[in-house]
């Protein structure tokens, strides 16, 4: 039994780091393998992650980390019974993938303005809480070419756009994702999408 693709890990910088790897053949990850992880610190103790299958030869492990700070560094040991298959390390702050925003809501009752709001996925005491920026994706269900991205570079989890920038009388969907420049993170997954029917009063044309 050998590791074909070494584990790569990303952290949500809150409570979970996810590591994925591939074995050289079909593997029952949960019965055959264990991933041990330990904070590099005098008083820390080793924790065990039981991996799950992720395709035939792929494995994934969700490492529980109830707290993360920028200095944290973990040792990782992948075991098959008594055999050490791979040894490595992982610094969560250098491999951050933020949590996806949630509770995306489209408020259509504000004059002819669309107000999109969502929730910051982090609690106020988490470092990323005040460092997230967002991308909002709006697209038409009727017209695949009607697809747009709005970059929200301020901290407030909301976006206002004129309803007239979208076509009237058709349905749109929106979703939002997040990233943090401070840790040069990857983008989060997209939030679940929300749907609304766009309608607004066309301005009266005078001739």
């Amino acid at each position: 039994m050998k590791v074909l693709q070494e584990p790569t890990c990303v952290s949500d910088y809150m409570s979970i780091s996810t590591c994925e790897w591939k074995m050289n053949g079909p593997t029952n990850c949960s019965t055959e393998l264990r991933l041990l992880y330990q904070l590099v610190f005098l008083l820390s103790e080793a924790h065990t992650c039981i991996p799950e299958n992720n395709g035939g030869a792929g494995c994934v492990c969700h490492l529980l980390m109830d707290d993360v700070v920028s200095a944290d560094n973990y040792t990782l040991d992948l075991w098959a019974g008594q055999q050490l298959l791979w040894k490595g390390s992982f610094k969560p702050s250098e491999h951050v993938k933020p949590r996806a925003p949630g509770n995306l809501t489209v408020h259509t009752n504000v004059s002819d303005t669309l107000l999109l709001t969502w929730s910051n996925p982090y609690p106020p005491d988490n470092y990323l809480y005040n460092h997230l920026t967002y991308a909002v994706n709006i697209w038409s269900e009727n017209d695949p070419a009607d697809f747009r991205i709005y970059n929200v570079t301020y901290l407030e989890p909301s976006l206002r756009i004129a309803a007239s920038t979208l076509k009237s009388g058709i349905s749109y969907r929106a979703r939002v994702r997040a990233w943090a420049q401070c840790y040069n993170t990857t983008w989060s997954e997209w939030s679940p999408s929300t749907k609304w029917h766009n309608s607004y009063r066309e301005p009266f044309e005078q001739h």
Epitope: L39, L42, L43, E45, D66, D67, V69
Partner: antibody, heavy 122, light 107 residues
Framework: EVQLVESGGGLVQPGGSLRLSCAAS????????MHWVRQAPGKGLEWVSY????????YYADTVKGRFTISRDNAKNSLYLQMNSLRAEDTAVYYC???????????????WGQGTLVTVSS | DIQMTQSPSSLSASVGDRVTITCRAS??????LNWYQQKPGKAPKLLIY???RLHSGVPSRFSGSGSGTDFTLTISSLQPEDIATYYC?????????FGQGTKLEIK
């Protein structure tokens, strides 16, 4: 409610031995690392020894290394400190304290016992 | 060994005063700095861990700050029950060392 109760202290002659115990209750003892910390009369706190939850890691202060032995029995929810070759300067109140193994607590000594007094004198 | 030096060794303040105690480490200890409160004849109690995190049940008038070698414990509005000796402690390197303590009294 978390409780740590030390016992075994008393008067002992220089060169003698004593075994301190710390009985734990109100939490899952086997999940926590444990320390011994002492305080000489009228003085400050001095760390003595540490043992990890599964006894795999043990540390001692240089002042007690080779004379003191820390151990634990998770089945009995108990921590011990075997003290040999005692000296007058070992006279102190001895406290047991736990640390959480969860990273969020960052390994501080979050609960302490009330202490047991060890007096080394002839 | 890392030396932990607290200042002042003792201080007298009035109820309602803002009180600051400092702790200096002889070398970088990251943020692994804890503060304990000990009342006469009692065991120490954890106040603040990892420089600035408040232990559960500790009043919000206590706060901590700093990093590296210089750390501060602040009591925003001194209360009569805060009369005690305060100790800082580093757990970044062996042996784990405490400051000599700061005895806080009411004027």
């Amino acid at each position: 409610e978390v409780q740590l109760v030390e016992s075994g202290g008393g008067l002992v002659q220089p060169g003698g031995s004593l075994r301190l115990s710390c009985a734990a209750s109100g939490f899952t003892f086997s999940d926590y690392g444990m320390h011994w910390v002492r305080q000489a009369p009228g003085k400050g706190l001095e760390w003595v020894s540490y043992i990890s939850s599964g006894s795999t890691t043990i540390y001692y202060a240089d002042t007690v290394k080779g004379r003191f032995t820390i151990s634990r029995d998770n089945a009995k929810n108990s921590l011990y400190l075997q003290m040999n070759s005692l000296r007058a300067e070992d006279t102190a109140v001895y406290y047991c304290a736990r640390i959480s193994t969860v990273v969020a607590k960052r390994y501080a000594m979050d609960y302490w016992g009330q202490g047991t007094l060890v007096t080394v004198s002839s | 060994d890392i030396q932990m030096t607290q200042s002042p060794s003792s201080l007298s303040a009035s109820v309602g005063d803002r009180v600051t105690i400092t702790c200096r480490a002889s070398q970088d200890i990251s943020n692994y700095l804890n503060w304990y409160q000990q009342k006469p004849g009692k065991a120490p109690k954890l106040l603040i861990y990892y420089t600035s995190r408040l232990h559960s049940g500790v009043p919000s008038r206590f706060s901590g700050s700093g990093s590296g070698t210089d750390f501060t414990l602040t009591i925003s509005s001194l209360q009569p029950e805060d009369i005690a000796t305060y100790y800082c402690q580093q757990i970044n390197a062996l042996p784990f060392t405490f400051g000599q303590g700061t005895k806080l009294e009411i004027k």
